[in-house]
Amino acid sequence: SERCDDWGLDTMRQIQVFEDEPARIKCPLFEHFLKFNYSTAHSAGLTLIWYWTRQDRDLEEPINFRLPENRISKEKDVLWFRPTLLNDTGNYTCMLRNTTYCSKVAFPLEVVQKDSCFNSPMKLPVHKLYIEYGIQRITCPNVDGYFPSSVKPTITWYMGCYKIQNFNNVIPEGMNLSFLIALISNNGNYTCVVTYPENGRTFHLTRTLTVKVVGSPKNAVPPVIHSPNDHVVYEKEPGEELLIPCTVYFSFLMDSRNEVWWTIDGKKPDDITIDVTINESISHSRTEDETRTQILSIKKVTSEDLKRSYVCHARSAKGEVAKAAKVKQKVPAPRYTVELACGFGAT
């Protein structure tokens, strides 16, 4: 056969679907690889062909579209399973071709099992809700195109294993789940089960997502430097190790680039001829506020180093702050013998 533009195995389309549920999978060619859509391709006389390679096999084989009750079918650029079976797992290829043109891409499909509490190896999308922010909603994802708008499905929402009914601040509203005031206690996995009829059969779609309650933009503040501060003086003798921690609190801000850095005499530590190391650690609160600590370390400090200005800077999308550390040279205690001699007027 003639040369075919092979886009390889697109692992970005690592599709996971639940066993014994309908699945509709669009050919990724039109979404990510080609500059035209299926309708244009079809009008130009191109044919879309599907085939697959079973899990742990090397042999490509055609998809059987003659199964009872049309369990697997194709409609335009969509491959349908009504429903899936565990052994449908494998790599699927869609190929667009005519006598002069050919383009194809493969993608992995994994059919996964779930238990009665919806636990499974499925990778879950995360939806962030702002804490105490007023009414916020999540929507049952990826159910478009499974049934016509004339069909009215029933939707049941669960938190973990429990059906959501008579919850204090969580109200099911069809495809949406409303949180009146999101609290930390609302963190968890939420599942919608959509049930709809089709040709005398009943199908279920199960969709689970993780809700994470994060800090509200209403409460967001510029970075706060806890250390260095005015209460701590770093008093050292030459030859000792100087350790200055810079500890900064950042409010959670969606997509904010939080940064902490030290300057010495207004310059990057690298631009100064002293042997400085800086170690960073980052921790997060339950609402994803962030605390960054950067410890500036000079192994053997000199009297010159103790005269320098050490400033910690912090910046987020909310603003910028800076704080100088109080560094000074320790005054050596007077030697007792000298003091005594002076007291007696010795010369």
Partner: antibody, heavy 118, light 106 residues
């Protein structure tokens, strides 16, 4: 003298993988956040990935999330970019660049060319 | 995502003239950064924190602006200044660049 030298570029088929390296010298590598920035032929600059000083935090744009992985070895003063499921639109010159605090991308490598084509 | 739009796309001027390049952000950013790129070379940092000159950059370059509107000015063009200029925001992920302004000799 600060130097960043990229390597590992080349021709790869769609769906294939490539690992880029960036060897750093002339500065305290572990004190700097590092990034990869790419430039498709005749196009502008596009940020691809960033890694924190210690390597524990990584950041990506949606276009490469799940396909590209940035990592670093501070003992070897080397930055890496593992690129999987490559597509034609990933064809570009890939630069590594360092950043410190409010000094973003003050030094860049000379770039390494990645071509994705069947 | 914060989108940066640079104008004009191309600016044709003569050496000695003043160049004004604009960068507009789709939402407010704290600071803007500017880079210069010549053909076949890596970009070079010109301006950081909106108005600070990077190390080794001549004083004819200056930056200004706040919020969503930022400007790079070259007071008197030298022959070596003809290149592509990019603005970049550093406030939010994903980090984004403008599409570039090509400064060419008239």
């Amino acid at each position: 003298e600060v130097q960043l030298v990229e390597s590992g570029g080349g021709l790869v088929q769609p769906g294939g993988s490539l690992r880029l390296s960036c060897a750093a010298s002339g500065f305290t590598f572990s004190s700097y956040a590092m990034s990869w920035v790419r430039q498709a032929p005749g196009k502008g600059l596009v940020w691809v990935a960033e890694i924190s000083r210690g390597g524990s935090h990584t950041y990506y744009p949606d276009t490469v999330t799940g396909r590209f992985t940035i990592s670093r070895d501070n003992a070897k003063n080397t930055l890496y970019l593992q690129m999987n499921s490559l597509r034609a639109e990933d064809t570009a010159v890939y630069y590594c660049a360092r950043s410190y605090g409010n000094y973003p991308f003050d030094y860049w490598g000379q770039g390494t060319t990645v071509t994705v084509s069947s | 995502e914060i989108v940066l739009t640079q104008s004009p796309a191309t600016l044709s001027l003569s050496p000695g003239e003043r160049a004004t390049l604009s960068c507009s952000a789709s939402s407010s950013v704290s600071y803007m950064y500017w880079y210069q790129q010549k053909p076949g070379q890596a970009p070079r940092l010109l301006i950081y924190d909106t108005s600070n000159l990077a190390s080794g950059i001549p004083a004819r370059f200056s930056g200004s602006g706040s919020g969503t509107d930022f400007t790079l000015t070259i007071s008197s063009l030298e022959p070596e200044d003809f290149a592509v200029y990019y603005c970049q925001q550093w406030s939010s992920y994903p980090l984004t660049f403008g599409q570039g302004t090509k400064l060419e000799i008239k």
